[in-house]
Protein backbone atom coordinates (compact mmCIF):
# COMPACT_ATOMS: atom_id res chain seq x y z
CA UNK A 1 0.00 0.00 0.00
CA UNK A 2 1.21 3.17 -1.49
CA UNK A 3 -0.05 6.90 0.62
CA UNK A 4 1.52 9.86 -0.17
CA UNK A 5 -0.47 13.27 1.59
CA UNK A 6 0.06 16.27 2.87
CA UNK A 7 -0.27 16.99 6.93
CA UNK A 8 -0.13 19.75 9.63
CA UNK A 9 1.98 17.59 11.97
CA UNK A 10 5.69 18.29 12.50
CA UNK A 11 8.53 15.70 10.94
CA UNK A 12 7.61 12.38 12.32
CA UNK A 13 10.91 11.28 11.51
CA UNK A 14 13.52 11.36 13.60
CA UNK A 15 16.44 9.07 12.09
CA UNK A 16 16.51 7.72 8.56
CA UNK A 17 17.67 4.67 6.99
CA UNK A 18 19.08 3.49 3.58
CA UNK A 19 19.32 0.46 4.02
CA UNK A 20 17.15 -1.82 1.11
CA UNK A 21 14.25 -3.10 2.29
CA UNK A 22 12.62 -5.86 -0.34
CA UNK A 23 9.26 -4.93 -1.18
CA UNK A 24 8.12 -8.62 -0.54
CA UNK A 25 8.44 -6.92 3.24
CA UNK A 26 6.68 -3.93 2.68
CA UNK A 27 3.21 -3.62 4.16
CA UNK A 28 2.60 0.20 3.62
CA UNK A 29 4.59 3.20 2.42
CA UNK A 30 3.74 6.78 3.27
CA UNK A 31 4.99 9.87 1.46
CA UNK A 32 4.88 13.00 3.46
CA UNK A 33 5.54 15.86 1.38
CA UNK A 34 7.90 18.67 2.44
CA UNK A 35 5.99 21.88 4.15
CA UNK A 36 2.95 22.04 6.43
CA UNK A 37 5.63 21.66 9.48
CA UNK A 38 8.31 20.02 8.45
CA UNK A 39 10.86 21.11 6.33
CA UNK A 40 11.95 17.97 4.05
CA UNK A 41 10.08 14.77 2.37
CA UNK A 42 9.86 11.87 4.58
CA UNK A 43 9.29 8.52 3.66
CA UNK A 44 7.39 5.75 6.21
CA UNK A 45 7.96 2.44 5.37
CA UNK A 46 5.67 -0.32 7.59
CA UNK A 47 7.18 -3.81 7.23
CA UNK A 48 5.49 -6.96 7.48
CA UNK A 49 7.74 -8.14 10.55
CA UNK A 50 5.02 -4.80 12.62
CA UNK A 51 8.11 -2.84 12.37
CA UNK A 52 8.54 0.81 11.06
CA UNK A 53 11.48 3.10 9.70
CA UNK A 54 11.68 6.15 7.63
CA UNK A 55 13.37 6.00 4.28
CA UNK A 56 16.19 8.02 3.61
CA UNK A 57 14.38 9.78 0.06
CA UNK A 58 17.56 9.90 -1.42
CA UNK A 59 18.16 6.25 -1.21
CA UNK A 60 18.33 4.80 -4.84
CA UNK A 61 16.23 1.96 -4.12
CA UNK A 62 13.07 3.58 -2.68
CA UNK A 63 13.57 6.30 -5.40
CA UNK A 64 13.25 3.51 -7.87
CA UNK A 65 10.24 1.96 -6.16
CA UNK A 66 7.96 4.91 -5.93
CA UNK A 67 8.48 5.39 -9.51
CA UNK A 68 7.36 2.29 -10.78
CA UNK A 69 4.42 2.48 -8.62
CA UNK A 70 3.74 6.10 -9.71
CA UNK A 71 3.73 4.51 -13.43
CA UNK A 72 1.14 1.96 -11.68
CA UNK A 73 -1.01 4.88 -10.73
CA UNK A 74 -0.14 7.94 -12.50
CA UNK A 75 -3.85 7.31 -14.50
CA UNK A 76 -5.62 7.71 -11.26
CA UNK A 77 -4.13 9.62 -9.21
CA UNK A 78 -5.07 12.87 -8.51
CA UNK A 79 -3.03 16.11 -8.21
CA UNK A 80 -1.61 17.63 -5.97
CA UNK A 81 -2.93 16.52 -2.57
CA UNK A 82 -3.97 13.05 -2.45
CA UNK A 83 -4.25 10.24 -0.75
CA UNK A 84 -4.02 6.78 -2.29
CA UNK A 85 -3.66 3.17 -1.75
CA UNK A 86 -1.79 1.36 -4.22
CA UNK A 87 -2.37 -2.79 -3.72
CA UNK B 1 -7.72 8.94 26.96
CA UNK B 2 -6.15 6.07 26.54
CA UNK B 3 -6.27 3.79 29.30
CA UNK B 4 -5.97 -0.02 30.12
CA UNK B 5 -6.45 -2.49 33.17
CA UNK B 6 -5.19 -5.89 33.78
CA UNK B 7 -7.51 -8.17 35.56
CA UNK B 8 -6.48 -12.11 36.78
CA UNK B 9 -7.08 -14.65 39.70
CA UNK B 10 -4.94 -13.03 42.40
CA UNK B 11 -3.60 -16.68 43.33
CA UNK B 12 -3.18 -19.96 42.19
CA UNK B 13 -1.35 -23.10 41.81
CA UNK B 14 1.11 -25.06 40.31
CA UNK B 15 0.49 -26.91 37.28
CA UNK B 16 -2.72 -24.33 36.80
CA UNK B 17 -3.55 -22.82 33.44
CA UNK B 18 -3.17 -17.82 34.08
CA UNK B 19 -5.79 -17.24 32.37
CA UNK B 20 -5.28 -12.97 32.72
CA UNK B 21 -7.42 -10.26 30.55
CA UNK B 22 -6.58 -6.47 29.59
CA UNK B 23 -9.47 -4.53 29.29
CA UNK B 24 -9.11 -1.27 26.82
CA UNK B 25 -10.06 2.28 26.06
CA UNK B 26 -9.23 5.35 23.69
CA UNK B 27 -7.80 3.10 21.04
CA UNK B 28 -9.26 0.11 18.91
CA UNK B 29 -7.81 -3.15 17.89
CA UNK B 30 -9.09 -3.20 14.35
CA UNK B 31 -7.27 0.35 13.62
CA UNK B 32 -4.42 -0.40 11.19
CA UNK B 33 -0.75 -0.31 13.44
CA UNK B 34 -2.86 -0.86 17.05
CA UNK B 35 -1.01 -3.71 19.42
CA UNK B 36 -1.32 -4.69 22.73
CA UNK B 37 1.88 -6.48 24.43
CA UNK B 38 2.06 -8.45 27.82
CA UNK B 39 5.23 -7.93 30.15
CA UNK B 40 5.70 -9.23 33.84
CA UNK B 41 7.46 -8.58 36.55
CA UNK B 42 8.82 -10.43 39.56
CA UNK B 43 8.82 -8.26 42.53
CA UNK B 44 11.89 -6.46 43.11
CA UNK B 45 12.95 -7.78 39.62
CA UNK B 46 13.32 -6.54 36.08
CA UNK B 47 10.93 -6.35 33.18
CA UNK B 48 10.24 -9.51 30.90
CA UNK B 49 8.65 -9.20 27.17
CA UNK B 50 5.96 -12.34 26.91
CA UNK B 51 3.91 -11.67 23.93
CA UNK B 52 2.19 -9.01 21.49
CA UNK B 53 -0.88 -9.57 19.52
CA UNK B 54 -1.65 -6.73 16.52
CA UNK B 55 -4.59 -5.41 14.92
CA UNK B 56 -4.34 -8.26 12.17
CA UNK B 57 -4.42 -10.92 14.83
CA UNK B 58 -0.31 -11.31 14.09
CA UNK B 59 0.99 -12.96 17.47
CA UNK B 60 4.58 -12.40 18.61
CA UNK B 61 5.73 -14.52 21.68
CA UNK B 62 8.94 -14.66 24.02
CA UNK B 63 10.58 -17.83 22.48
CA UNK B 64 11.62 -18.77 26.36
CA UNK B 65 7.85 -18.88 27.48
CA UNK B 66 6.34 -19.62 23.79
CA UNK B 67 5.10 -23.34 24.38
CA UNK B 68 3.51 -21.70 27.47
CA UNK B 69 1.71 -18.94 26.32
CA UNK B 70 -1.30 -17.98 24.45
CA UNK B 71 -2.10 -14.80 23.49
CA UNK B 72 -5.63 -13.12 22.05
CA UNK B 73 -8.55 -11.07 21.34
CA UNK B 74 -11.76 -10.11 21.34
CA UNK B 75 -11.84 -6.76 18.95
CA UNK B 76 -15.49 -6.18 19.80
CA UNK B 77 -14.98 -5.54 23.33
CA UNK B 78 -11.48 -3.78 23.29
CA UNK B 79 -10.22 -7.06 25.39
CA UNK B 80 -6.75 -8.23 25.39
CA UNK B 81 -5.95 -12.26 26.97
CA UNK B 82 -2.54 -14.18 27.77
CA UNK B 83 -2.69 -17.50 28.74
CA UNK B 84 0.36 -19.34 30.37
CA UNK B 85 0.07 -22.63 31.01
CA UNK B 86 1.51 -24.92 33.48
CA UNK B 87 2.52 -22.41 36.04
CA UNK B 88 5.45 -22.36 38.66
CA UNK B 89 6.74 -20.47 41.40
CA UNK B 90 8.74 -18.93 39.04
CA UNK B 91 5.86 -17.08 37.22
CA UNK B 92 4.53 -14.94 40.40
CA UNK B 93 4.93 -11.80 39.55
CA UNK B 94 3.17 -8.77 38.68
CA UNK B 95 1.79 -8.86 35.11
CA UNK B 96 0.73 -5.40 33.08
CA UNK B 97 -0.43 -4.95 29.48
CA UNK B 98 0.41 -2.41 27.25
CA UNK B 99 -0.60 -0.97 23.61
CA UNK B 100 1.77 -0.02 21.24
CA UNK B 101 0.94 1.49 17.96
CA UNK B 102 3.12 1.16 15.09
CA UNK B 103 3.55 4.70 14.09
CA UNK B 104 6.42 7.44 13.72
CA UNK B 105 7.81 7.84 15.94
CA UNK B 106 7.57 4.49 17.07
CA UNK B 107 7.07 4.32 20.86
CA UNK B 108 6.43 0.66 22.13
CA UNK B 109 4.12 0.14 25.14
CA UNK B 110 3.29 4.14 25.03
CA UNK B 111 0.45 3.53 27.80
CA UNK B 112 0.75 0.83 30.34
CA UNK B 113 -1.76 -0.91 32.52
CA UNK B 114 -1.51 -0.82 36.51
CA UNK B 115 -0.44 -4.18 36.59
CA UNK B 116 -1.86 -7.13 38.34
CA UNK B 117 -0.43 -9.22 40.75
CA UNK B 118 0.14 -12.86 40.19
CA UNK B 119 1.24 -15.41 42.88
CA UNK B 120 1.54 -19.26 42.28
CA UNK B 121 1.90 -20.90 45.64
CA UNK B 122 1.10 -24.31 47.27
CA UNK C 1 17.99 -12.72 21.19
CA UNK C 2 19.88 -9.83 21.64
CA UNK C 3 21.00 -9.34 25.47
CA UNK C 4 20.53 -6.28 27.75
CA UNK C 5 23.10 -5.16 29.89
CA UNK C 6 22.01 -2.49 32.15
CA UNK C 7 24.80 -0.92 34.42
CA UNK C 8 24.53 -0.02 37.55
CA UNK C 9 21.93 -2.29 38.95
CA UNK C 10 21.74 0.57 41.43
CA UNK C 11 23.10 3.32 42.75
CA UNK C 12 22.41 6.24 45.13
CA UNK C 13 23.37 9.57 44.27
CA UNK C 14 22.70 13.48 45.70
CA UNK C 15 20.35 16.20 44.90
CA UNK C 16 21.90 18.16 42.06
CA UNK C 17 24.32 15.15 40.82
CA UNK C 18 24.85 14.51 37.88
CA UNK C 19 24.15 10.64 37.32
CA UNK C 20 24.44 7.82 34.29
CA UNK C 21 22.96 5.01 33.85
CA UNK C 22 24.02 2.75 30.77
CA UNK C 23 22.83 -0.42 28.66
CA UNK C 24 24.85 -2.33 26.39
CA UNK C 25 23.46 -4.70 23.47
CA UNK C 26 24.64 -7.95 22.83
CA UNK C 27 24.58 -6.61 19.08
CA UNK C 28 24.12 -3.06 17.39
CA UNK C 29 21.10 -2.19 17.88
CA UNK C 30 20.53 0.99 15.43
CA UNK C 31 19.25 3.09 17.89
CA UNK C 32 15.90 0.99 18.38
CA UNK C 33 15.98 1.79 22.34
CA UNK C 34 13.70 3.26 24.96
CA UNK C 35 14.24 4.32 28.49
CA UNK C 36 11.69 3.63 31.05
CA UNK C 37 11.10 5.30 34.32
CA UNK C 38 9.17 3.14 36.97
CA UNK C 39 8.01 4.83 40.31
CA UNK C 40 7.62 2.93 43.43
CA UNK C 41 4.64 0.91 43.17
CA UNK C 42 3.58 2.56 39.65
CA UNK C 43 4.08 1.66 36.14
CA UNK C 44 6.93 2.06 33.61
CA UNK C 45 6.31 5.21 31.21
CA UNK C 46 8.48 6.10 28.66
CA UNK C 47 10.99 8.85 29.31
CA UNK C 48 13.50 8.74 26.05
CA UNK C 49 12.86 6.94 22.65
CA UNK C 50 14.92 6.06 19.86
CA UNK C 51 17.51 6.21 22.48
CA UNK C 52 18.01 10.24 22.14
CA UNK C 53 14.51 11.91 21.94
CA UNK C 54 12.47 13.10 24.98
CA UNK C 55 8.73 11.93 25.47
CA UNK C 56 6.18 14.47 25.90
CA UNK C 57 6.27 15.99 29.67
CA UNK C 58 9.79 14.98 30.36
CA UNK C 59 12.03 17.18 32.01
CA UNK C 60 14.95 18.57 29.79
CA UNK C 61 17.18 17.58 32.37
CA UNK C 62 16.83 14.21 31.16
CA UNK C 63 18.56 12.87 27.96
CA UNK C 64 19.77 9.83 26.09
CA UNK C 65 22.71 9.52 23.90
CA UNK C 66 24.54 6.24 22.44
CA UNK C 67 24.40 4.91 18.95
CA UNK C 68 25.50 0.76 17.99
CA UNK C 69 25.28 -1.19 21.08
CA UNK C 70 26.03 1.31 23.58
CA UNK C 71 23.09 3.51 24.59
CA UNK C 72 23.33 5.85 27.94
CA UNK C 73 20.86 7.89 30.27
CA UNK C 74 21.42 10.84 31.91
CA UNK C 75 19.97 13.33 34.39
CA UNK C 76 22.34 16.56 34.71
CA UNK C 77 21.07 17.32 38.09
CA UNK C 78 19.54 14.71 39.96
CA UNK C 79 15.92 15.93 41.68
CA UNK C 80 13.68 13.91 44.45
CA UNK C 81 11.22 13.20 41.96
CA UNK C 82 14.15 11.12 39.81
CA UNK C 83 13.84 8.37 42.40
CA UNK C 84 12.88 5.60 40.45
CA UNK C 85 14.32 2.33 38.85
CA UNK C 86 15.19 2.97 35.04
CA UNK C 87 14.49 0.40 32.29
CA UNK C 88 15.96 -0.05 28.81
CA UNK C 89 14.32 -1.77 26.27
CA UNK C 90 15.32 -2.79 22.68
CA UNK C 91 12.82 -3.28 19.84
CA UNK C 92 15.27 -4.20 17.01
CA UNK C 93 14.07 -7.30 16.92
CA UNK C 94 11.84 -9.59 18.92
CA UNK C 95 11.76 -10.90 21.47
CA UNK C 96 11.99 -7.31 22.57
CA UNK C 97 14.32 -7.32 25.39
CA UNK C 98 14.65 -5.09 28.97
CA UNK C 99 17.81 -4.59 30.65
CA UNK C 100 17.97 -5.52 34.17
CA UNK C 101 16.92 -2.46 35.84
CA UNK C 102 18.17 0.05 37.99
CA UNK C 103 17.41 1.24 40.86
CA UNK C 104 18.15 4.95 41.32
CA UNK C 105 17.93 6.36 45.11
CA UNK C 106 18.94 9.60 46.71
CA UNK C 107 21.28 10.16 49.39
Known amino acids: VLEVYYTSLRCRCVQESSVFIPRRFIDRIQILPRGNGCPRKEIIVWKKNKSIVCVDPQAEWIQRMMEVLRKRSSSTLPVPVFKRKIP | QVTLKESGPGILQPSQTLSLTCTFS??????????VGWIRQPSGKGLEWLAN???????YYNPSLKNRLTISKDTSNNQAFLKITNVDTADTATYYCARSEIVMPYVPFDYWGQGVMVTVSS | DIQMTQSPSSMSASLGDRVTITCQASQDIGNDLIWFQQKPGKSPRPMIY???NLANGVPSRFSGSGSGSVYSLTISSLESEDMADYHC?????????FGSGTKLEIK
Open chain 3, 89 to 97: LQFKQYPFT
Open chain 2, 26 to 35: GFSLSTYGMG
Open chain 2, 53 to 59: IWWDDDK
Open chain 3, 50 to 52: YAT
